[in-house]
């Protein structure tokens, strides 16, 4: 059977095309450095196809290698602000299950107001990704300035 | 029929593998903040497989979720220059059709001379992406410093 | 035959899903600006599926268009350090075969301590990618701060 036909007949999920792009919902209460995310067409251009949100954190539904990417822009920021409030650091990691807890991606703002990066990493079904912003500066909620996403690449 | 065989028999375009990587052609005339792009093997390592260029702007040919990425380096730049000419901002967005106009990705240079980022976003056939560089500094034309591309990820 | 079944029967390599994510092993001896990489599950979250390492440099095994990405963080660094030691530059390029030598991606640190970027580029079987860090500052070996990878995207 031709792949083009098979592609139409099978649900995309069976092809392993899990993908999500999230926008910032809010920051955590004091002592909780996590950013809380939201996604869905009603919110704009964010979406979840496969992964799910669990109390604002992204949970993986399919084992595989993923491209994880993030951009975070600080809300009221100039290079002076950024250097005065240094260190402000963003870390993306697996925060649960605890047995798999690890930092995957870490960047500091130094004299800049935006960080952006991406990496390939193996993730397993049930892994929850957390994004920790440490420091006193707050992230922008503009959807073109702060976003976080994953894309399944291969088993 | 084995997928490996089917893959060889079907044109790649039917698999939805639209992809483009562009190099800077030139900046716009006064009052036009858009960067104008070019692509094709004769120019070096840039290419268009699916998407097209319309007067230097990238037009999408296939609906789907795309990974959009960009790097822009300023031509004559040091951290002193960048901060003295602040704000210099790069925004990538859908600029036509007007009904779908939206900013997808935005970064400021602050005290840096390069911005680089990427994001997942839904795009539709006919969407034209524009990259607006606002400020008085000019972008580098070096192909390893300034580039812009998209990759179809899934329907 | 359903694609889901065919996918399980064929080795992934025949689908062209070459991918690698590397962590820093060490820097080169004096006069050698290259970073030397390592990968494999025993080392943590790095891996090579298709591409290989040749004396710490990444060698491509399959022709195609690849997404190349990198993040490098300087080891003992503040914005003051970075500007005092300027220029510190990172370039990713094809370093062999010599006939195909070209710079693909170049960034300077200016007043920042991390660079991160990505781009799409055609690569051919046998191309070896080198990552040259020029300047007097050393890269961090933390696996969440410094990494380099490629992902096959299409033929």
């Amino acid at each position: 059977q031709r792949f083009a036909q098979a592609q139409q007949q099978l649900p995309l999920e069976s092809l392993g095309w899990d993908v999500a792009e999230l926008q910032l919902n809010h920051t955590g209460p004091q002592q909780d450095p996590r950013l809380y995310w939201q996604g869905g067409p009603a919110l704009g251009r964010s979406f979840l196809h496969g992964p799910e949100l669990d109390k604002g954190q992204l949970r993986i539904h399919r084992d595989g290698i993923y491209m994880v990417h993030i951009q975070v822009t600080l809300a009221i920021c100039s290079s002076t602000t950024a250097s005065r409030h240094h260190p402000t650091t963003l870390a993306v990691g697996i925060c649960s299950p605890a047995s798999r807890s690890i930092s995957l991606l870490r960047l500091s703002f130094h004299q800049g107001c935006t960080i952006a990066s991406q990496r390939l990493t193996p993730l397993a079904r049930g892994d929850t990704l957390c994004t920790n912003l440490t420091g006193t500066l707050l992230p922008s909620r503009n959807t073109d300035e702060t976003f976080f996403g994953v894309q399944w690449v291969r088993p | 029929q084995r997928f490996a065989q089917a893959q060889q028999q079907l044109p790649l375009e039917s698999l939805g593998w639209d992809v483009a990587e562009l190099q800077l052609n030139h900046t716009g005339p006064q009052q036009d903040p858009r960067l104008y792009w070019q692509g094709g093997p004769a120019l070096g390592r840039s290419f268009l497989h699916g998407p097209e260029l319309d007067k230097g702007q990238l037009r999408i040919h296939r609906d789907g979720i795309y990974m959009v990425h960009i790097q822009v380096t300023l031509a004559i730049c040091s951290s002193t220059t960048a901060s003295r000419h602040h704000p210099t901002t790069l925004a990538v967005g859908i600029c036509s059709p007007a009904s779908r106009s939206i900013s997808l990705l935005r970064l400021s240079f602050h005290q840096g001379c390069t911005i680089a980022s990427q994001r997942l976003t839904p795009l539709a056939r006919g969407d034209t992406l524009c990259t607006n560089l606002t400020g008085t500094l000019l972008p580098s034309r070096n192909t390893d410093e300034t580039f812009f591309g998209v990759q179809w990820v899934r329907p | 035959q359903r694609f889901a079944q065919a996918q399980q029967q064929l080795p992934l390599e025949s689908l062209g899903w070459d991918v690698a994510e590397l962590q820093l092993n060490h820097t080169g001896p004096q006069q050698d600006p290259r970073l030397y990489w390592q990968g494999g599950p025993a080392l943590g979250r790095s891996f090579l599926h298709g591409p290989e390492l040749d004396k710490g440099q990444l060698r491509i095994h399959r022709d195609g268009i690849y997404m190349v990405h990198i993040q490098v963080t300087l080891a003992i660094c503040s914005s003051t350090t970075a500007s005092r030691h300027h220029p510190t530059t990172l370039a990713v390029g094809i370093c062999s075969p010599a006939s195909r030598s070209i710079s693909l991606l170049r960034l300077s640190f200016h007043q920042g301590c991390t660079i991160a970027s990505q781009r799409l580029t055609p690569l051919a079987r046998g191309d070896t990618l080198c990552t040259n860090l020029t300047g007097t500052l050393l890269p961090s070996r933390n696996t969440d701060e410094t990494f380099f990878g490629v992902q096959w995207v299409r033929p």
Epitope: - | N25, H26, T27, P29, Q30, L138, R141 | -
Partner: nanobody, 113 residues
């Protein structure tokens, strides 16, 4: 195709001034961003100044305040006025249509007492 010819180079004493000119052949000149670069023997070419079709200018830190780029679209000319010249300004100076990668043949500037 646009062709570029530089002139105005020569020998000048430290602290002195020179004005370099670059004549362009084609009518598309007025739409081009133009640049001045220089190259010291054995080193890479460095970009000094850019001027857009509309007259906006960018300068490298090390020449800002000493060098001025300007253009005359009616005459298809671009200029580089160089003041307070130093021995380290000695180089071959090139004019180029920046985004087209079109270059002139260069003019030698030597700053020496």
């Amino acid at each position: 195709q646009l062709q570029l010819v530089e002139s105005g180079g020569g020998l000048v004493q430290p602290g002195g001034s020179l004005r370099l000119s670059c004549a362009a052949s084609a009518g598309t000149f007025r739409f081009k961003t133009m640049g001045w670069h220089r190259q010291v023997q054995g080193k890479q070419r460095e970009l000094l100044a850019l001027i857009t079709s509309g007259g906006s200018t960018n300068y490298a830190d090390f020449v800002e305040g000493r060098f001025t780029i300007s253009r005359d679209n009616a005459k298809n000319l671009v200029y580089l006025q160089m003041n307070s010249l130093k021995p380290e300004d000695t180089a071959v100076y090139y004019c180029n249509a920046y985004y087209d990668d079109i270059w002139g043949q260069g003019t030698q500037v030597t700053v020496s007492s």
